[in-house]
């Protein structure tokens, strides 16, 4: 799978995470940091 | 499906305001960017902002600074599109955008004509 | 604020044409350009993100190329149905549109 960082009006994205481009799925995808999950590494949990 | 539906045309006179909402179905606007772009009749395609619902941050054209206002409401997951002192060159399709995960998806867009 | 510069503005080409679009940024843009194709009465449609990345359901005879700051459109072989208007959008930072180039049948 293809990745490249995220387009730069995507800094804030990742709320908890980093923000990583999926090339060939087209996608934005945020790596969520340990105890952080969510489309946007919104929710913590223990 | 994953739907952007805009609120009806609207007349208004030189100087009023307009207010435009974007109701989202089909996905959670928390999880997107809702942008704005415009259209004037025969013009190109203008980017006029966006809002990040999550955060409520919004990031303005320079030209439209301190004329526009870009709002959510998360709990109706809709977006709006505020422009004030409107005048005659304002006249447009308005379009609001999602973007975030995946690449951009449209509204239907809403004629907005200003005319006294 | 990035600038898009599109050229041409307008063109007429024949039927099976080779068809080609830039679009320069003021400044790099990192491959982040999509390219619209919008016809009278309807929203924009698009056709490719991520410089080449083609949409489903979009004929192959459309793509797209460039780095940094210079992109280019092609329509390998014009069509009728491809009679439009077409527009780059960078979305590195924010986002910019192009003018436009106006493409009709010669």
């Known amino acids: 799978v293809s990745i490249t960082k995220c387009n730069s009006d995507m800094n804030g994205y990742c709320l908890h995470g980093q923000c990583i481009y999926l090339v060939d799925m087209s996608q934005n995808y945020c790596r969520c940091e340990v105890g952080y999950t969510g489309v946007r590494c919104e929710h913590f949990y223990l | 499906q994953d739907q952007l539906v805009q609120s009806g045309a609207e007349v208004k006179n030189p100087g009023a305001s307009v207010k435009v909402s974007c109701k989202a179905s089909?996905?959670?606007?928390?999880?997107?960017?809702i942008q704005w772009v415009r259209q004037a009749p025969g013009q190109g395609l203008e980017w006029m902002g966006r809002i990040d619902p999550l955060r409520r941050q919004t990031k303005y054209r320079e030209k439209f600074e301190g004329r526009v206002t870009i709002t959510a409401d998360t709990s109706t997951n809709t977006a709006y599109m505020e422009l004030s002192s409107l005048r005659s060159e304002d006249t447009a399709v308005y379009y609001c955008?999602?973007?975030?995960?995946?690449?951009?998806?449209w509204g239907q867009g809403t004629l907005v004509t200003v005319s006294s | 604020d990035i600038q898009m510069t599109q050229s041409p503005s307008s063109l007429s080409a024949s039927v099976g044409d080779r068809v080609t679009i830039t679009c320069r940024a003021s400044q790099d843009i990192h491959k982040y350009i999509a390219w619209y194709q919008q016809k009278p009465g309807q929203a924009p449609r698009l056709l490719i993100q991520?410089?080449?990345t083609l949409q489903p359901g979009v004929p192959s005879r459309f793509s797209g190329s460039g780095s940094g700051t210079d992109y280019t459109f092609t329509i390998s072989s014009l069509q009728p149905e491809d009679i439009a208007t077409y527009y780059c959008l960078q979305y590195d930072n924010l986002r910019t549109f192009g003018g436009g180039t106006k493409v009709e049948i010669k």
């Open positions: 089909g996905f959670n606007i928390k999880d997107t960017y």
């Open positions: 991520y410089t080449s």
């Open positions: 955008v999602r973007s975030g995960r995946e690449f951009d998806f």
